[in-house]
């Protein structure tokens, strides 16, 4: 007569994180008396998942009623699966014994693989702003996915980037994985409205990739161009001199007028106008009382933009 066999019909089971895994097991006999136990892993370090005889296993339910006479179905369901549950599960028949039950026969094992979605990609740029023509690095990170296979792409304004490096960790077997990618982007003066996008595609996303974005407005600094011009005389002894501050970003800007090197007035850009490319223009003027000067006057428009060293433009005012 054949002795009891423990049958685990499924070599592997694939379950999405958060769902319930069903691990199937049947015995061919009710002999010997003793419980079925489920373990994850083999050997002395194996983890007890369920014991028919005793214990409390809140995540585990049996598929059939084990108190029913003649029941030989020892399949279990494990709820709320996470990547940490991945592994090989063994259905093991024990024989009633004193002082402890004795392992009698084990099933061949069922490998539980957990499909876990990657977290939303987080894109981060450089800590400090950079100016056009400079190359800056952006990083993209996503975590907690399984299996390991994943695709990451970079885009700038819809155009795919090619200068990037990607790593998936760890290299060996793990319950879940992380991806880290660094892309290099060359800034242009038109990038205030630009976006850098990191796109992650994974089997769990069913063809709908996750995206993380970074706005280059947080990375770029476009320094202003200055132009100082003298307007026609407004009154008998007053001259209006304007300083045109053009194409700058961000808005944070302070302007100082100097008359022959002496500070005349300082102001902060407030009512700026915005260009189509996202940069700003601003104009400041200075009324100079010509009669107060016997000699020619050197007028300087000095601009400090976004905490950077000041740039200036001068204009010589002739006193006739």
């Amino acid at each position: 007569e054949e002795e009891l066999q423990v049958i685990q019909p499924d070599k592997s089971v694939l379950v999405a994180a958060g769902e319930t895994a069903t691990l199937r097991c049947t015995a061919t006999s009710l002999i010997p008396v003793g419980p079925i136990q489920w373990f994850r892993g083999a050997g002395p370090g194996r983890e007890l998942i369920y014991n028919q005889k005793e214990g409390h296993f809140p995540r585990v339910t049996t598929v059939s009623d084990l108190t029913k006479r003649n029941n030989m179905d020892f399949s279990i369901r494990i709820g709320n699966i996470t990547p940490a549950d991945a592994g090989t599960y063994y259905c093991v028949k024990f024989r009633k014994g004193s002082p402890d039950d004795v392992e009698f026969k084990s099933g061949a094992g069922t490998e539980l693989s957990v499909r876990a979605k990657p977290s939303a990609p987080v894109v981060s740029g450089p800590a400090a702003r950079a100016t056009p023509q400079h190359t800056v690095s952006f990083t993209c990170e996503s975590h907690g996915f399984s299996p390991r296979d994943i695709t990451l792409k970079w885009f700038k304004n819809g155009n795919e980037l090619s200068d990037f490096q990607t790593n998936v960790d760890p290299v060996g077997e793990s319950v879940s994985y992380s991806i880290h990618s660094t892309a290099k982007v060359v800034l242009t003066r038109e990038d205030v409205h630009s976006q850098v996008i990191c796109e992650v595609a994974h089997v769990t996303l069913q063809g709908d990739p996750l995206r993380g974005t970074a706005n280059l407005s947080e990375t770029i600094r476009v320094p202003p161009t200055l132009e100082v011009t003298q307007q026609p005389v407004r009154a008998e002894n007053q001259v209006n001199v304007t300083c045109q501050v053009r194409k700058f970003y961000p808005q944070r800007l302070q302007l100082t007028w100097l008359e022959n090197g002496n500070v005349s007035r300082t102001e902060t850009a407030s009512t700026v106008t915005e260009n189509k490319d996202g940069t700003y223009n601003w104009m400041s003027w200075l009324l100079v009382n010509v009669s107060a000067h016997r000699d020619d006057v050197k007028l300087t428009c000095q601009v400090e933009h976004d905490g950077q060293p000041a740039v200036s433009k001068s204009h010589d005012l002739k006193v006739s």
């Epitope: 008396v33 005889k53 009633k96």
Partner: antibody, heavy 115, light 111 residues
Framework: RQLVESGGGLVQPGGSLRLSCTAS????????ISWVRQAPGKGLEYIGT?????ITYFASWAKGRFTGSKTSSTAYMELSSLRSEDTAVYFC????????????WGQGTLVTVSS | DIVMTQSPSSLSASVGDRVTITCQAS????????LAWYQQKPGQAPKLLIY???TLATGVPSRFSGSGSGTDFTLTISSLQPEDFATYYC???????????FGQGTKVEIK
């Protein structure tokens, strides 16, 4: 679905007897068959369980004198070195206890040990 | 070996009465629930009523119930019927597979 015992009768002290337990309507292959006896006017006494091969066990008082075997349809129990105190009705039942309790039972067969 | 002590050894009751029989094990039964109750009528084989301490066997009326864990167990008949007059046995299993012992029985008689 029933069990029928046979093989009981009168046997002299020191003698042997082979009891049979035959299943009809179901197979014994995935179940143990347990034997229980009841001396006249007394309570029930567990003897042992016949499983497969190595999975056959008897109460400590029955070891050595009682042995058993089983096919898919019939279980056997061999009684040897019989004594007068072994006089009893011998029942067989399907099951090995715990989550496989004794059910159904045979009608019993009387073994009388007397000279 | 495990020893099962049943009480009372006999009782007299009327139809409709609630009857309680107890069974005490000398040590915790296997899995704290290896306890079955059987009913036997004169000249008949025993019949399974309850197993795993509290699981009602198929076809057994719901007036029979079992409770308990470890060493102390109870069989309750909520409303005694004429066909319930019989002898009741508990069967407890110890940790060894051959360690199965019946209680001495409780005879339920008509008052």
């Amino acid at each position: 679905r029933q069990l029928v015992e046979s093989g009981g009768g009168l046997v002299q002290p020191g003698g042997s007897l082979r009891l049979s337990c035959t299943a009809s309507g179901f197979s014994l292959s995935s179940h143990g068959i347990s034997w229980v006896r009841q001396a006249p006017g007394k309570g029930l006494e567990y003897i042992g369980t016949i499983g497969t091969g190595v999975i056959t066990y008897f109460a400590s008082w029955a070891k050595g004198r009682f042995t058993g075997s089983k096919t898919s349809s019939t279980a056997y129990m061999e009684l040897s070195s019989l004594r007068s105190e072994d006089t009893a009705v011998y029942f067989c039942a399907r099951g090995s206890a715990w989550n496989d309790p004794f059910d159904p039972w045979g009608q019993g067969t009387l073994v009388t040990v007397s000279s | 070996d495990i020893v099962m002590t049943q009480s009372p050894s006999s009782l007299s009751a009327s139809v409709g009465d609630r009857v309680t029989i107890t069974c005490q094990a000398s040590q915790s039964v296997y899995g704290n629930n290896d306890l079955a109750w059987y009913q036997q009528k004169p000249g008949q084989a025993p019949k399974l009523l309850i197993y795993l301490a509290s699981t009602l066997a198929t076809g057994v009326p719901s007036r029979f119930s079992g409770s308990g864990s470890g060493t102390d167990f109870t069989l309750t008949i909520s409303s005694l019927q004429p066909e319930d007059f019989a002898t009741y046995y508990c069967l407890g299993g110890g940790d060894d597979e051959a360690d199965n012992t019946f209680g001495q029985g409780t005879k339920v008689e008509i008052k």
